[in-house]
Each structure stands twice: as structure tokens, then as C-alpha cells.
């Protein structure tokens, strides 16, 4: 039975040209996290495997940095980066958990940043 829940940064906004940290946290389960995949709609951004390390999709290698932790840092944001992002937690023995983050990239310099999510 899957008992875990994923907490995410939720809906966040950031300025064009800036950077943002995408983070998720899996709680309420003792399942072992084996891998986290970061995806944007139909695209794979990155994979963080607990043992093998990071894979960064070549399409994003100049604008994506691994971490902190299992999170992902998006840099040099453009308005085209606006959209849904998913953290897909592969766990054993539970299976797969998915979290959703909506990022809005604003032209204006008055973009309000969502509260940064901290993993305790």
C-alpha cells in the first residue's frame, strides 16, 4: 500500500533571466527513494539516481544544475519556461509517486517568488 505523500513548492513565479529551485519532498513512507526524474510536460530534464548520480538532458545542460539534494535548479529563465514541472519519485517497494510544480516566468521585475521549500 502506498502511504507516502509528496510536498512540493507548489505554484511559484520567477523573473525572466533569473533562476529558481524546484524541490519536492516525499514523506509519510519508509520506502527507499531509488531515483527522481524531473520532467517538464513531455520533456525529460534530469534524472537523479541515488547510486549512479545525475543525468542532465543535453537540451537543458546549459540551463539546469543538479541539486540542491534531489532538487533541480533552473537558470537563465525565459518566458517559455512557464508551465508544469513534475518530480517523479521511484521508490522501493512502494512504486512511483509524482509531484507537480507550476512555474510562471514573468517579464516584470516585480515577480513574487514562491516561498522556498526547505527539506528538513
Amino acid at each position: 500500500m502506498m502511504t507516502g505523500t509528496i510536498e512540493t513548492t507548489g505554484n511559484i513565479s520567477a523573473e525572466k533571466g533569473g533562476s529558481i529551485i524546484l524541490q519536492c519532498h516525499l514523506s509519510s513512507t519508509t520506502a527507499q527513494v531509488t531515483q527522481v526524474n524531473w520532467e517538464q510536460q513531455d520533456q525529460l530534464l534530469a534524472i537523479c539516481n541515488a547510486d549512479l548520480g545525475w543525468h542532465i538532458s543535453p537540451s537543458f545542460k546549459d540551463r539546469v544544475a543538479p541539486g540542491p539534494g534531489l532538487g533541480l535548479t533552473l537558470q537563465s529563465l525565459t518566458v517559455n519556461d512557464t508551465g508544469e514541472y513534475f518530480c517523479i519519485y521511484h521508490t522501493y517497494p512502494d512504486g512511483t509517486y509524482t509531484g507537480r510544480i507550476f512555474l510562471e516566468v514573468l517579464e516584470s521585475s516585480v515577480a513574487e517568488h514562491g516561498a522556498r521549500f526547505q527539506i528538513p
Epitope: T34, Q35, N37, E39, D42, Q43, L44, I47, N49, A50, D51, L52, G53, W54, H55, I56, S57, P58, S59, K61, P66, H90
Partner: antibody, heavy 119, light 107 residues
Framework: QVQLVQSGAEVKKPGASVKVSCKAS????????MHWVRQAPGQGLEWIGG????????LIHQKFKGRATLTVDKSISTAYMELSRLRSDDTAVYYC????????????WGQGTTVTVSS | DIQMTQSPSSLSASVGDRVTITCKAS??????VAWYQQKPGKAPKLLIY???FRYTGVPSRFSGSGSGADFTLTISSLQPEDFATYYC?????????FGQGTKVEIK
Amino acid sequence: QVQLVQSGAEVKKPGASVKVSCKASGFTFTEYTMHWVRQAPGQGLEWIGGINAKFGRQLIHQKFKGRATLTVDKSISTAYMELSRLRSDDTAVYYCARSSYYRFDLDYWGQGTTVTVSS
Amino acid sequence: DIQMTQSPSSLSASVGDRVTITCKASQDVKTAVAWYQQKPGKAPKLLIYSASFRYTGVPSRFSGSGSGADFTLTISSLQPEDFATYYCQQHYTTPWTFGQGTKVEIK
């Protein structure tokens, strides 16, 4: 230039163990993950597992758990794969390969080590 | 485990032919697919990574495409040195898995 040089062919009896080595040169060994892939005669490729050379963390395919052990010796930039309780269907060419920096494809491969299991 | 199914398993072609090999994943793997070439008695060589990126030094006649569950390796004009076996591999999730291979033979 990048090179992965594997140890020589082995002939083993069923139930025995084999340890294959893979000596790396031409790159910073601890910045990469080393993988092992095998190929039975006339068959396709099968991933056994990988090991992060910096931290020594290994990930083994469930099929080989309990039989395969991956290790590294950072001081001599060498990766090892030990397979125990050998069976005749473990007869194969065993390759070590390096996964690219921040990528999960296998960009350099060793020349292969033939392991024959026969009574 | 994710199954990677290649087709055809073998094909005969002539020098100069356009050759297409397909690989179908049993589930969505986004673009986490690589293609390798293997000649008899030799280790595989990386051709294409992340579905469509040509690896360093690989001739431009090789190209990869696809995302999700369907992927294609194309050789635009087959050369004598291209007769070999080709494998796809997914790394979307472990265990990493390979297709069964496609042998390209001389017609």
C-alpha cells in the same frame, strides 16, 4: 586518450566465482560511473549494474543481486566485477563501460572479457 | 523492467541505401534512449544519446529521433563499414535495458 583495459579470459567450473578487472586511464576516474554489461554467445546486451567511482555506491540489476559485486580501487583507477555461484548460462563476454559525465549513456567500453563456465 | 523491442531483427541492404531501425519501449521513457553499433568480436560503440544527439566523431549519416515510446535510428546512406548490429538502450529507470539488436547485412 580514454582507455578501459580488461583482464584476460577465464574458464571456471559451475559454482565457482570469477573476478574481472577494468583498468581506466585518460580521464579522472572518480568523476565517472563504471558499468558492467554482458553478452552471451550470439545474444544481445544485458546490463549487470554500475558503481559510482567516487563514493563506491553500487547499483546491481535485481537479476544479479546476491551474486554480483562491483567494487573500485581508486588508487589504481580500476573497477572490478565479481560474479559468484557461476552457472553455465553465465558464459558470456563481460564488458566494462563508462557512463558519460552527467549522462547515462555508455560512451567508452572495454575490449571485453570472455568468461566460460563449464564442468 | 522496461522492455525495448527492436524491429526488424535483421535486414539486408546495399551500399547507398537508406536504412531505418525502430525501437519501441514498453512504457514512456521520454528521450532517455541511446543507440550503439557493434561489430563481430568488438565492443559496442555509442552512436546516439538522448534519442537524437549524435556522439562525438559519429558520421552525420547517422541520426536518431523519437520520444515517449517510439524511437528510430536512421542511416541515410549505408556505407560498407556500417554493416553491424545496432542496439537501443533505455536509461529512464533502472535496470537499464537494451533492445535485442538489429543486424544489418549486405544484400
